[in-house]
Structure formats: C-alpha cells, structure tokens
C-alpha cells in the first residue's frame, strides 16, 4: 500500500512525451520506470539491513530530480549528487569486484561469493541496472519514445552520467586488494574507453588501494594462451603502476569450472589451475 500511495500522489508526472517531440537515436525510457525504481528500492532496503532506514520516496525524488525537466544532453554529475548521497552505502572496501564487458559472469560470481560486491550489488547499481531513462527540457514528463545514444547523440545523457558518477564513487570507496573481471574474448581485453578504463581505474585511491588484481576470463575451452601478456593488459599494468598501485593478473581458463569451484571449494578438482 505504501507504493500505491506514492504512485497515486505522482501520477501526473508519468505521462509519456508526445510522439511528435524530439527523437533521439537510443531506446526510450524503460516501461514503468518509476514503478520499477521504487519497487527495486523497497525490495533492496528490505533485504539489506544496513539500508533499511532509507526512505525510498526520497530516493525516487532525488532520482527524478536528476533528469526531469532537464535537457537530456546537458546532465551533470552535480545533478545526481542528492541521489548519490541518499544511496551512500558502506560495503566492505576490500571486497569490491569491478568488471568490464563481462557483467553476467561478475554477477554470477557475487551471487555465489556473497561477501564480494559489484556495483550492481549496491542500492544505486541495483536500482538502475539494465534500465534507460531520460526527460525533456522544461517539461515534467518522462520520455518513453527515445533517449540520447552515447555515440550518436551525446555523452552527457542521464544514463551515461549516472553510471559515470556512481562508478567513480564506487571506485573511490575501494581499499586493499581490488579485483576486476575482464573479458578475454574481446579484441581489447582492457579498453581505455570503458567505464572501468575511463572512470574506475583513475578513481582508485592509492593511499587506500594496495593492489589491483585482474581476472582475465577465457572464452574458448581450448584457449590456453596467457592473456595476461596481452598488450592491453600491459597497458593497464602501466596505468596502475604509475598511480602507485601494484598490479597482478590471473587467467581464468574455464569460467564454468571457476564458478563451480567458488561454490564448492573443497572439490578435489579445484586444486588445479582453472
């Protein structure tokens, strides 16, 4: 009934932008976006005791305030400051798993290894995962038709700025040994233009972070190459070393077995290299 009250009070804001309005190149706001954000917030705060006191109505107000009535190509990190603040969350700073171009495996891993956290295991990451949203300048409406594409339209769009902002804060909070899962099947295993490469790497705090450990995930069963020697991994090592953070790298040759061994570490086959 709490959710229903919230929806009733705010119905006016959720009309679609008329079809004749500006068309962007990207997909429009995810259907039932406000309801989805609120429902996810309620679910998350019920499950995570340290966030139980968070007021999901205030969280939605802050989320909405970041992009409603604003030009969707002119969003700033400052617009998201209230949401970032309300979503402040203390995760064990030595249990952070970053990822690049391999989200599903990273999430499967933290679902098993419950003491480790990806960004999407935090409240803010969970709220926005796989969602799209944007508004329109000077109207209080959400645009369900189209939203700016990062490449074709503009980079300072609501979704991109959100992920940049929340990723920066997540990286800033990390300490000790930070892990990153990288996709060994891609031509650029480490991509300087990814969120990891452009935001998170540069916001790890050298005074708190001792080591960045990369896990390079192999795609083919017969792939026995040492992908830690890949030129892009060497580039990552160079960037990290210049920031006075140590770097290490491990090949995960068989991700299926890797997950199995995380689930059952006492299995005799888990002593060999995976």
């Amino acid at each position: 009934s709490g959710l229903n009250d919230i929806f009733e009070a705010q119905k006016i804001e959720w009309h679609e932008v008329p079809r004749w309005r500006q068309q962007w190149s990207g997909p429009g706001t995810t259907k039932r976006f406000p309801e989805t954000v609120l429902a996810r917030c309620v679910k998350y705060t019920e499950i995570h005791p340290e966030m139980r006191h968070v007021d999901c109505q205030s969280v939605w107000d802050a989320f909405k305030g970041a992009f409603i009535s604003k030009h969707p190509c002119n969003i700033t990190e400052e617009d998201y400051q209230p949401l970032m603040k309300l979503g402040t969350q203390t995760v064990p700073c030595n249990k952070i798993l970053l990822w690049s171009r391999i989200k599903d495996l990273a999430h499967q891993f933290t679902q098993v290894q419950r003491d480790m956290f990806t960004l999407e295991d935090t409240l803010l990451g969970y709220l926005a995962d796989d969602l799209t949203w944007c508004g329109e300048f000077n109207t209080s409406k959400i645009n369900y038709q189209s939203c700016p594409d990062w490449r074709k339209d503009c980079s300072n769009n609501p979704v991109s700025v959100f992920w940049k902002t929340v990723s920066r804060r997540f990286a800033e909070a990390a300490c000790d040994v930070v892990h990153v899962m990288l996709n060994g099947s891609r031509s650029k295993i480490f991509d300087k233009n990814s969120t990891f490469g452009s935001v998170e790497v540069h916001n790890l705090q050298p005074e708190k972070v001792q080591t960045l450990e990369a896990w390079v995930i192999h795609g083919g069963r017969e792939d026995s190459r040492d992908l830690c020697q890949d030129p892009t991994i060497k580039e990552l090592e160079s960037i990290i070393s210049k920031r006075n953070i140590q770097f290490s790298c491990k090949n995960i040759y068989r991700p299926d077995k890797f997950l199995q061994c995380v689930k059952n570490p006492e299995d005799s086959s888990c002593t060999s290299e995976i």
Partner: antibody, heavy 121, light 110 residues
Framework: EVQLLESGGGLVQPGGSLRLSCAAS????????IIWIRQAPGKGLEWVAA?????????YYADWAKGRFTVSKDNSKNTVYLQMNSLRAEDTAVYYC???????????????WGQGTLVTV | DIQLTQSPSTLSASVGDRVTITCRSS????????LAWYQQKPGKAPKLLMY???NLASGVPSRFSGSGSGTEFTLTISSVQPDDFATYYC??????????FGGGTKVEIK
C-alpha cells in the same frame, strides 16, 4: 560571509508543537544540504533531519525523528524550517542548523553552523 | 543503531602536552575514512577540525592531525595550546547518508 541564524526556540508543554527557523545568507542556498542537529544540555550531538532543494525538496530524517518532525524550506526567504510535534521532555536541547560541505568528496561533514536555539519541553 | 565511542571522556593536559583522543565506531564508516572531528567551546557551536579522517579543515592549525580507517580513528594535538581546551567530538558518515556523533572528550587544563 556564510551565516546561519536559528530562531523559534522557547518553552513548550509536553505534547505541544514548535516551528524552528534557520535563515541563511552569504551563499547559494539551493546548492547545499542543510542539516538540523541537536544537543541536549550537557550531552553530545545528534542529527535530526536533512533537506536539499535544487528543484524539488529532497529530505530525510533520523529514524527517531520520522513522523514527529518535518523539515521544509522556503527558497524565496532563504529559510529552512523544522516543525516539531508531540514534543517530549527528552526533546529539550539546543537545536542547530548546519551547512554540509559541498561536493561529493566532502559530503557528510558540517562546515558552517548557526549559533543554536534552545527548546525546553 | 550505530555507536561512536570516544575515549577518554575527560582528559587533563598541560600546555605543550601531546594529546590523543580515540574514536571507535560500531560499524565501518563510509569509504573506510568518512570521519570528521569537531571542537566545541561552552555556549558555542561546534567547529569542523578534520574531515575524511586525516584532512585538515580550512584555517585549522597544523598541530591537529587525524588518522585511522574503518572503525578506529584518532585525533592528535601535537602540542596543546591554551585555545585548545574544549570538548572534541568525532562524527561518522554511514549507509543511507546517516550521521552519528561520539559522546565527546573534554580536554581540560591540568
């Protein structure tokens, strides 16, 4: 110069209500979180509520304050209010408003404080 | 509820002494270092001394320093001056943007 000035304190009967004001000057009011913090006589500090209103009001409360206390803001008057209902003897305290440091690296700290206003229940 | 425990509650010192105040949090603060220290004199509002555990606030003398991370923090005054006799509070920042203050440490003249 940044200034915060509280008013509205006084003597009130248990069960009564009071509205405190915090008038701000010397800074761009909309760009900062304003926090109410209280201090019982001879005791430590305790946060009450927070508000920020770049466009609409965003506010939240300490668990114990939810339901009885309401924070609001009048941007035209550069003033933040704390409406306190169903007051109890244990609400007796000096009530301060404070401005949080600006910027994500600095949030969570209070750089500017008012002089406080005493509420006696 | 989050508890911030300061020790000692009272501390007697002479001018020139080195003074250390400890603050322990029942939960880790945000970002492992999101803790502040304030100084308060009788009848006055608190004044920010340190933020993010070890960063000196604007205008604060360098004899003040802070350290610690996670749940244990210290404030040190390397050489106490007459102006430093006051009560000191630690303040943590936590999940959901909640705040908690320590019970205070009164530094008095020996």
């Amino acid at each position: 110069e940044v200034q915060l000035l509280e008013s509205g304190g006084g003597l009130v009967q248990p069960g009564g209500s009071l509205r405190l004001s915090c008038a701000a000057s010397g800074f761009s009011f909309n760009n900062y979180w304003i926090i109410w913090i209280r201090q019982a006589p001879g005791k430590g500090l305790e946060w009450v509520a927070a508000i920020y209103s770049p466009s609409g009001d965003i506010k939240y409360y300490a668990d114990w304050a939810k339901g009885r206390f309401t924070v609001s803001k009048d941007n035209s008057k550069n003033t933040v209010y704390l409406q306190m209902n169903s007051l109890r003897a244990e609400d007796t305290a000096v009530y301060y408003c404070a401005r949080e440091l600006s910027g994500s690296s600095y949030e969570g700290y209070f750089e500017s404080w008012g002089q406080g206003t005493l509420v006696t229940v | 509820d989050i508890q911030l425990t300061q020790s000692p509650s009272t501390l007697s010192a002479s001018v020139g002494d080195r003074v250390t105040i400890t603050c322990r949090s029942s939960q880790s603060v945000y970002g492992h270092n999101w803790l502040a220290w304030y100084q308060q004199k009788p009848g006055k509002a608190p004044k920010l001394l340190m933020y993010r555990a070890s960063n000196l606030a604007s205008g604060v003398p360098s004899r003040f320093s802070g350290s610690g991370s996670g749940t244990e923090f210290t404030l040190t005054i390397s050489s106490v001056q007459p102006d430093d006799f006051a009560t000191y509070y630690c303040q943590g920042y936590y999940s959901g943007a909640s705040y908690a203050f320590g019970g205070g440490t009164k530094v008095e003249i020996k």
